[in-house]
């Protein structure tokens, strides 16, 4: 289809991407599915500038991003290289902690209350952020 020049209604434009910020919670996989059904993906943070933008909009609330290590190495959902890319982990994180008693370790990354990242149990119902590139975004999405 033809490229779009503005973000869908209720999405926020920033640096040629469109962002949607949830106000309720889902497990990581369910949040991922939500974004996909919107022709988007969980947010991929590629710079300190983007980190600050997202952090400003989500506030001090645990919020999923598009980063996980469910299949071994850490991977961004859009294929962005993790090893050479931007990172903002809390000290001592990620730690794949098993002490939560929920079974398994911690395979999904989220923004913490101070914006830095932590790995946590993917089933926790956190808020999330969807992102889509501006030239892929529709102009008039459903009202949310």
């Amino acid at each position: 289809g033809s490229e779009r020049t503005c973000c869908p209604v209720n999405w926020v434009e920033h640096e040629r991407s469109c962002y949607w910020f949830s106000r309720s919670g889902k497990a990581w996989a369910d949040a991922d599915n939500y974004c996909r059904l919107e022709d988007a993906h969980l947010v991929v943070v590629t710079s300190w500038e983007e980190q600050k933008f997202v952090q400003h909009h989500i506030g001090p609330v645990n919020t999923w991003m598009g980063l996980h290590d469910q299949n071994g190495p850490w991977k961004w959902v859009d294929g962005t290289d993790y090893e050479t890319g931007f990172k903002n982990w809390r000290p001592e994180q990620p730690d794949d902690w098993y002490g939560h008693g929920l079974g398994g370790g911690e395979d999904c990354a989220h923004f913490t209350d101070d914006g830095r990242w932590n790995d946590d149990v993917c089933q926790r119902p956190y808020r999330w952020v969807c992102e889509t590139e501006l030239d892929k975004a529709s102009q008039e999405p459903p009202l949310l």
């Epitope: 309720s24 369910d30 974004c35 008039e140 459903p142």
Partner: antibody, heavy 120, light 107 residues
Framework: EVQLLESGGGLVQPGGSLRLSCAAS????????MSWVRQAPGKGLEWVSA????????HYADSVKGRFTISRDNSKNTLYLQMNSLRAEDTAVYSC?????????????WGQGTLVTVSS | DIQMTQSPSSVSASVGDRVTITCRAS??????LAWYQQKPGKAPKLLIY???SLQSGVPSRFSGSGSGTDFTLTISSLQPEDFATYSC?????????FGQGTKVEIR
């Protein structure tokens, strides 16, 4: 006024195929995810499949995965459901439903449905 | 899959009655719950979403509540046009699933 009109239902033998269509009007079709939901006689509602605005992402109920294919043509404001390898248990009224709130997904408008009967 | 179980399966009531329908999820659904009304031969109508948000145009006698796995639809004063089948739906996880329906009949 939002309208969803299904067509393509009918009687088909087990193992056969049908293609359902849903013609949409009264809203900007290309900006909403869409779903198919079915209701077997005397039974409750069952979600069948969903498709994203562009058609690039799809989801299916396990009961139809590998047999049914959802698609859409935004230039024609039409949603489709290709149904292959039909079984008796697929007998139901099939309705298309519009996503009202993004990928939530709650359905704020539904079609009246088209009856699919699978019988020999 | 998340199973949605409604009770009762049917209820007989009179105009003006308060009617309560419950829906129980087999696991937590993070408040991703909707209620629909369906009349014979008609398309379902969205009444409530997000547990308690009233869809535009739906009368205020309909209300929803609950959290976790247990949810309730209440009709505060039943009207003649409310005799129908009511279904809950979870939208937390694929596959989205519905309750089996509760038929509200005239006593």
């Amino acid at each position: 006024e939002v309208q969803l009109l299904e067509s393509g239902g009918g009687l088909v033998q087990p193992g056969g195929s049908l293609r359902l269509s849903c013609a949409a009007s009264g809203f900007t079709f290309s900006t909403y995810a869409m779903s198919w939901v079915r209701q077997a006689p005397g039974k409750g509602l069952e979600w069948v499949s969903a498709i994203s605005r562009s058609g690039g992402n799809t989801h299916y109920a396990d009961s139809v995965k590998g047999r049914f294919t959802i698609s859409r043509d935004n230039s024609k404001n039409t949603l489709y459901l290709q149904m292959n390898s039909l079984r008796a248990e697929d007998t139901a009224v099939y309705s298309c439903a519009k996503d009202g709130f993004g990928g939530s997904s709650y359905f704020d408008y539904w079609g009246q449905g088209t009856l699919v009967t699978v019988s020999s | 899959d998340i199973q949605m179980t409604q009770s009762p399966s049917s209820v007989s009531a009179s105009v003006g009655d308060r009617v309560t329908i419950t829906c129980r999820a087999s696991q937590g659904i993070n408040n991703w719950l909707a209620w629909y009304q369906q009349k014979p031969g008609k398309a379902p109508k969205l009444l409530i979403y997000g547990v308690s948000s009233l869809q535009s145009g739906v009368p205020s006698r309909f209300s929803g509540s609950g959290s976790g796995t247990d949810f309730t639809l209440t009709i505060s004063s039943l009207q003649p046009e409310d005799f129908a089948t009511y279904s809950c739906q979870q939208a937390n996880s694929f596959p989205w699933t519905f309750g089996q329906g509760t038929k509200v009949e005239i006593r």
